[in-house]
Interface confidence: medium
């Protein structure tokens, strides 16, 4: 299963970085789980998951760094709280869960770049 | 004549970049002229250029944006005053003025990716 | 849907070599990624290699130079040439498989694969 997602994205100087994550959909899924990679020299790690119904929304756990929001066969997904040290390869995984046949499909990835901001000077 | 430089570099939240701009020469030259080239959507603009003897300072104009200093084939080149609107491919481009025969050579070029820092709150 | 099936697992001295197969059915996908996997008791689950469907590999350090994984696309079915093992590669060894060639080029992670065989456990004693 084809998953299409953008090849760079820089997170804004709050540390707010947001990507589509596009699934071509061999069956009708009506379950849909959906999970965040990150690659950072050859280290894989997972960054968020969440699995919906198809029409309804993502839900994150309370604790997640990722919110989204799912439209057809798109993902809108939102990873907040990023620093310098979080820059590396985000990988759209997408999994059809239900009705059977299983499908899987891998992104290419997303490089997020983030920089982080000077302080601002003290106000007092 | 081969130019290296990185294919990505960040902007700091200062709106400074700096790269290296490597070339093989293949002489023993005295003069050398690099000029940054940037482009964006096909338009290609000269940002700033030096002349330097070999073993002596890079100096640009006054009201450049760019610095830099140059140790044996290699050029350390800085932009200041970048903004979001700045991003693009900065390419290098390294002329072996003299003595003749004249080389040139260009590179191919470094993703500069500038974020616009958030404003500080008033402190008023 | 996707199925996996291991063999080839076994006891050997160490020095000794064995040659795992997988054999996979209901495989749709014009690019894809197969790769063995091993987990030793109490460890977590970690590549060994991995190969795509154009024949790009790739290895886990430790086992470059002794292991190679190939593949029948006229069988469907994957292999594992091992040789000279060491008591260090005693493990259950699983068969993978994902869709595109993602994994095969970049990282030997789970995380990557979705579709899984059982296992066989290869016992390599000293």
């Known amino acids: 299963m084809h998953v299409a997602q953008p090849a760079v994205v820089l997170a804004s100087s709050r540390g707010i970085a947001s990507f589509v994550c596009e699934y071509a959909s061999p069956g009708k899924a009506t379950e849909v789980r959906v999970t965040v990679l990150r690659q950072a020299d050859s280290q894989v790690t997972e960054v968020c998951a969440a699995t919906y119904m198809m029409g309804n929304e993502l839900t994150f756990l309370d604790d997640s760094i990722c919110t989204g929001t799912s439209s057809g066969n798109q993902v809108n997904l939102t990873i907040q709280g990023l620093r310098a040290m979080d820059t590396g390869l985000y990988i759209c995984k997408v999994e059809l869960m239900y009705p059977p046949p299983y499908y899987l499909g891998i992104g290419n990835g997303t490089q997020i770049y983030v920089i982080d901001p000077e302080p601002c000077p003290d106000s007092d | 004549m081969h130019v290296a430089q990185p294919a990505v570099v960040l902007a700091s939240s200062r709106g400074i970049a700096s790269f290296v701009c490597e070339y093989a020469s293949p002489g023993k030259a005295t003069e050398v002229r690099v000029t940054v080239l940037r482009q964006a959507d096909s338009q290609v603009t000269e940002v700033c250029a030096a002349t330097y003897m070999m073993g002596n300072e890079l100096t640009f104009l006054d009201d450049s944006i760019c610095t830099g200093t140059s140790s044996g084939n290699q050029v350390n080149l800085t932009i200041q005053g970048l903004r979001a609107m700045d991003t693009g491919l900065y390419i290098c481009k390294v002329e072996l003025m003299y003595p003749p025969p004249y080389y040139l050579g260009i590179g191919n070029g470094t993703q500069i990716y500038v974020i616009d820092p958030e404003p500080c709150p008033d402190s008023d | 849907q996707v199925q996996l099936q291991e063999s080839g697992g076994g006891s050997v001295q160490a020095g000794g070599s064995l040659r795992l197969s997988c054999a996979a059915s209901g495989y749709t996908y014009s690019s894809y990624s197969m790769g063995w996997f091993r987990q030793a008791a109490g460890k977590e689950r970690e590549g060994v290699a991995a190969i795509d469907s154009d024949g790009s590999t790739s290895y886990a350090d430790s086992v470059k130079g002794r292991f190679t994984i190939s593949q029948d696309n006229a069988k469907n079915t994957l292999y594992l040439q091992m040789n000279s093992l060491e008591p260090e590669d005693t493990a259950m060894y699983y068969c993978?498989?994902?869709?595109?060639?993602?994994?095969?080029?970049?990282?030997?992670?789970?995380?990557?694969?979705?579709?899984w065989g059982q296992g066989t456990q290869v016992t390599v004693s000293s």
């Open positions: 993978a498989a994902t869709a595109g060639w993602y994994a095969a080029r970049h990282a030997l992670s789970p995380l990557f694969f979705g579709y």
